[in-house]
């Protein structure tokens, strides 16, 4: 068969063949292979894994597989001068030191190159002073401390518990509060689920376990030294002082054994309420400083990490499209890990590997997708989404013209309860339809669809009989594609029961205990949840690359735009007097949303009725669908965040992981009652409403009949 004939096999048959080829046993085997040694970004081990993946993707049958390298700023602990925190007495003697490395898990005691826990990109420094406990170090926690409790963090070392928000936001907040250092720790209240044993006997965090992670505030910039441009051999690099997003104060993470020793001596103010108290046997006093007997003791940080320009490698595989080779559907996930990466990222990388193998098998049998599929194994995600961002910067002109969709493939699991999907509204119907065709892996749902178990376990808060789909935030490799370039994006993984498990992330996240055994013993022994995630991710890619008409429904965007407009209007209406005084109106925005709704409805009718055998018309309609997400991009970006350009969605300014709708308006309204110049502040709200109105109206017009 020729490739064009092969493409004409009925889509259902192709999709079924693709899905049937995916095997749980292969995912298990790949996960084991990817997790035997650490694959830290910038290391030889991770380069070797890149070459292995390149070679295997070629064997699987992709048309081409290339390594693309960039020289980016990374950060590592000093091997001969370890980072730690001390309690020092009045003579300056260290009477307690935090641990230098995590106790290695059984079977891994002799593995070399396990990077000790550190906060990537922390500057060097040895600040000493009194401790202040700042809860999760969220914006509202500092408001409580500074405004209500009148506690000044200036010149103090703050200790914050991990969870609720991205650690980089915690550090930024501490810096703004005048802190001289930050200690991050995992509290059992957030990282130890009741009734479960700690690793290696269960999936909970042991006392010596520590969460690594970067503490950047890049706001989508990619490599801190080359914002906006690829970090290639001729790139101009900023000096460290001008680098984007680097923290200015030392930061270090610790486990709860060590945290206990610091927190048990805390004096000063009592915690304001129970929401500030974790599960350690300590008073959770806020400070500043230690209590009576220990008041002369101080805390001292010893941070000696270095930042250095280091080479990273992406693997980019191509499966050329038979009909529209200039239209790209991208499946990407990262390869670099903090240590073994048992969940993050290798549970995702193993799924990508099996998806590539399945597509390759079909291709070897003569089939090709309608559109080109690009597969990516990103490097340095843990250091600020660097591999994906640099590649997208290098290929931005192609991507903005040809990018149909991006499907992210980091960790396949963060629990084993139900499906979790975050995506553009354009993909809602695709996800619903696909999950109705897939079998649920959940106990008690044998013979039922994934859609059914997902809806039952994670119902939509707005629409009964439908599952919840969340907004895209950031903290993963879809960021540059969605937030900067406006390429329709989505992600899917299996998650925990958020009702019963209130802890943040999964307990062993970014610790040395995130091993193959963790997954195989406790999360997914049969790899059935991994297989389901492979089917969802792979199925989405298949449909996006192979449907004659792109599986996007613009009417779903209309629905959410109305919801987001209502939400932001309600926030603003908490200040009715000021709205009146400064003539703030949302009428124009609601009008634009109404126009969008009407035009989207008419477009959907035309899409249903047009002659799909007419290649020009088909391409025209598909281009309107493809470019709709692009239409929400403002080339000027959001205030002070030039690389977050999507007007409808952006990562929250207070938590990178969370998505915020109408972020420009939201940020302009945030804490507006405390602004020194209310006239200027409300003027900015009005400016942001006008930008949002224009963008929604302009996007609507891209769906209008062309002539």
């Amino acid at each position: 068969k020729s490739s064009s004939e092969a493409t004409n096999i009925t889509p259902k048959h192709n999709m079924k063949a693709f899905l049937d080829e995916l095997k749980a046993e292969n995912i298990k085997k790949f996960l084991h292979n990817f997790t035997q040694i650490p694959h830290l970004a910038g290391t030889e081990q991770n380069f070797q894994l890149a070459k292995q993946i390149q070679s295997q993707w070629k064997e699987f049958g992709l048309d081409s597989v290339e390594l693309t390298h960039y020289d980016v700023l990374l950060s590592y602990p000093n091997k001969t001068h370890p980072n730690y925190i001390s309690i020092i007495n009045e003579d300056g003697n260290e009477i307690f030191n935090t641990s230098l490395f995590e106790p290695p898990p059984a079977g891994y005691e002799n593995v070399s190159d396990i990077v000790p826990p550190f906060s990537a990109f922390s500057p060097q420094g040895m600040p000493e002073g009194d401790l202040v406990y700042v809860n999760y170090a969220r914006t509202e926690d500092f408001f409580k401390l500074e405004r209500d409790m009148k506690i000044n963090c200036s010149g103090k070392i703050v200790i914050a518990r991990y969870g609720k928000v991205f650690r980089g936001n915690k550090v930024k907040n501490a810096q703004l509060a005048g802190a001289t250092g930050v200690i991050l720790y995992s509290d059992p209240a957030d990282y130890f689920a009741p009734g479960v044993k700690s690793y290696p006997d269960g999936w909970n965090l042991p006392g010596g376990g520590v969460q690594r992670g970067n503490i950047l505030n890049l706001n989508g910039a990619g490599d801190p030294l080359t914002p906006g441009y690829p970090a290639n051999e001729y790139a101009y690099r900023r000096g460290i002082a001008e680098a984007v997003g680097l923290p200015s104060i030392p930061v270090h993470p610790i486990g709860y054994y060590d945290a206990q020793k610091l927190l048990e001596k805390m004096g000063g103010s009592a915690s304001p309420d129970s929401s500030w108290r974790g599960s350690l046997k300590v008073p959770y006093n806020v400070g500043p400083g230690f209590t009576g007997n220990f008041s002369t003791q101080k805390v001292k940080m010893h941070i000696h990490s270095t930042s250095e320009v280091t080479r990273i490698y992406n693997v980019i595989g191509t499966l050329r499209g038979a009909v529209e080779p200039d239209r790209y559907v991208i499946l990407g996930g990262h390869r670099d890990s903090w240590v073994f990466g048992g969940i993050d990222p290798q549970s995702g990388a193993a799924v990508v590997h099996e998806i590539v193998r399945s597509f390759g098998t079909l291709k070897k049998e003569g089939w090709r997708p309608r559109r080109t599929i690009l597969f990516a194994s990103w490097d340095a995600e843990e250091f600020g989404l660097l591999g994906s961002t640099e590649w997208a910067e290098e290929n931005s002109r192609l991507l903005q013209e040809r990018g149909v969709a991006y499907i992210n493939a980091d960790s396949s699991i963060e629990g084993n309860y139900t499906l979790r999907v975050d995506c553009t509204p354009l993909m809602y119907s695709l996800v619903y339809n696909l999950t109705k065709e897939l079998e649920s892996p959940d106990e008690g749902f044998e013979g039922k669809s994934l859609y059914e178990s997902w809806t039952k376990k994670s119902p939509s808060p707005e629409f009964s009989g439908m599952p919840r789909i969340s907004k895209l935030g950031s903290g993963n490799d879809f960021e540059v594609f969605f937030q900067r370039l406006g390429i329709a994006s989505g992600r899917a993984r299996y998650t925990k029961n958020w009702e019963t498990n209130k802890f943040s992330s999964y307990p062993l996240y970014h610790s040395v205990y995130e091993t193959y055994e963790l997954v195989e013993k406790f999360y997914d022994p049969m790899f059935k949840y991994h297989l389901t995630v492979a089917q969802v991710r792979g199925g989405m890619v298949f449909e996006l690359a192979n449907s004659v008409v792109l599986p996007f429904d613009c009417r779903d965007y209309a629905v959410v735009l109305r919801k987001y407009a209502d939400k932001i209007y309600n926030i603003s209406m908490k200040h009715p007097q000021e709205m009146k005084t400064y003539s703030v109106s949302f009428d124009s925005l609601f009008s634009a949303v109404k126009n969008f709704t009407e035009i989207a409805s008419k477009f959907s009718e035309r899409l249903r009725d047009f002659d799909k055998s007419n290649p020009i018309l088909l391409r025209m309609m598909n281009d309107q669908l493809m470019f709709l997400e692009r239409a929400f991009i403002d080339p000027l970006g959001l205030p002070d965040r030039p690389f977050y350009r999507h007007v409808i969605y952006a990562p929250s300014s207070h938590n990178k992981y969370a998505g915020e709708s109408f972020p420009g308006i939201y940020d302009a309204l945030f804490d507006i009652e405390s602004k020194v110049d209310p006239s200027q502040a409300w003027g900015e709200v009005k400016r942001q409403i006008s930008i949002a109105t224009f963008t929604v109206q302009a996007a609507a017009e891209t769906l209008s009949e062309v002539a």
């Epitope: 935090t98 490395f101 106790p103 290695p104 005691e109 010596g208």
Partner: antibody, heavy 123, light 107 residues
């Protein structure tokens, strides 16, 4: 099987130095805190020093502080006790003992003991 | 520093007797207390940790109790092989001091 073997004991003059070693086998040495305990002839047990699994903390009995130094080499599965400025009252059997597996315990007793090595300080 | 005291310093009891040894800490140590048995000329043996948890392989006639500053070691039915000196030890905070020991023998 789990084993601790002390060595380095002997007769030494007051004021001189001695270095004791404790070779560990049969367990994941790099996960365990390690102690030295001594017992003077006909007397009770006296705790001497402890070192955390990663060497981050070292604590000493007041009687040896400033004279003895505990250390470890995880790559060699060995812990050491450097004893300087020895005194007659340091004469004892010195036991190496395993503390808690830090993967499981922060606080724990000493569950495995070596046979001991005798140190005699005499002129 | 935390001082540990034990009473009695020695005791004699008959086979089958219930024997209780007391250990007191000069300040609260939560339940971070261990008990050891040392027979004459032998290496100490770990009996109990966290004040009341029996180390595996230790006969069930041994039990521990207490919290804070006052602790007990009980042998419910004394056996000839229990003749030894028993030591308590604080491991709440360094220095991890031992008690002076209680010598147990058979009448």
């Amino acid at each position: 099987q789990v084993q601790l073997v002390e060595s380095g004991g002997g007769v030494v003059q007051p004021g001189r130095s001695l270095r004791l070693s404790c070779a560990a086998s049969g367990f994941a040495f790099s996960r365990y805190g390690m102690h030295w305990v001594r017992q003077a002839p006909g007397k009770g047990l006296e705790w001497v020093a402890v070192i955390w699994y990663d060497g981050s903390n070292k604590y000493y009995a007041d009687s040896v502080k400033g004279r003895f130094t505990i250390s470890r080499d995880n790559s060699k599965n060995t812990q050491y006790l450097q004893m300087n400025s020895l005194r007659a009252e340091d004469t004892a059997v010195y036991y190496c003992a395993r503390g808690g597996d830090f993967l499981y315990y922060y606080y724990y007793g000493m569950d495995v003991w070596g046979q001991g090595t005798t140190v005699t300080v005499s002129s | 520093d935390i001082q540990m005291t034990q009473s009695p310093s020695s005791l004699s009891a008959s086979v089958g007797d219930r024997v209780t040894i007391t250990c007191r800490a000069s300040q609260g140590i939560s339940n971070y207390l261990a008990w050891y048995q040392q027979k004459t000329g032998k290496v100490p043996k770990f009996l109990i940790y966290e004040a009341s948890t029996l180390q595996s392989g230790v006969p069930s006639r041994f039990s521990g109790g207490g919290s804070g500053t006052d602790f007990t070691l009980t042998i419910s039915s004394l056996q000839p092989e229990d003749v030894a000196t028993y030591y308590c030890q604080n491991y709440n905070s360094a220095p991890f001091t031992f008690g002076p020991g209680t010598k147990v023998d058979i009448k």
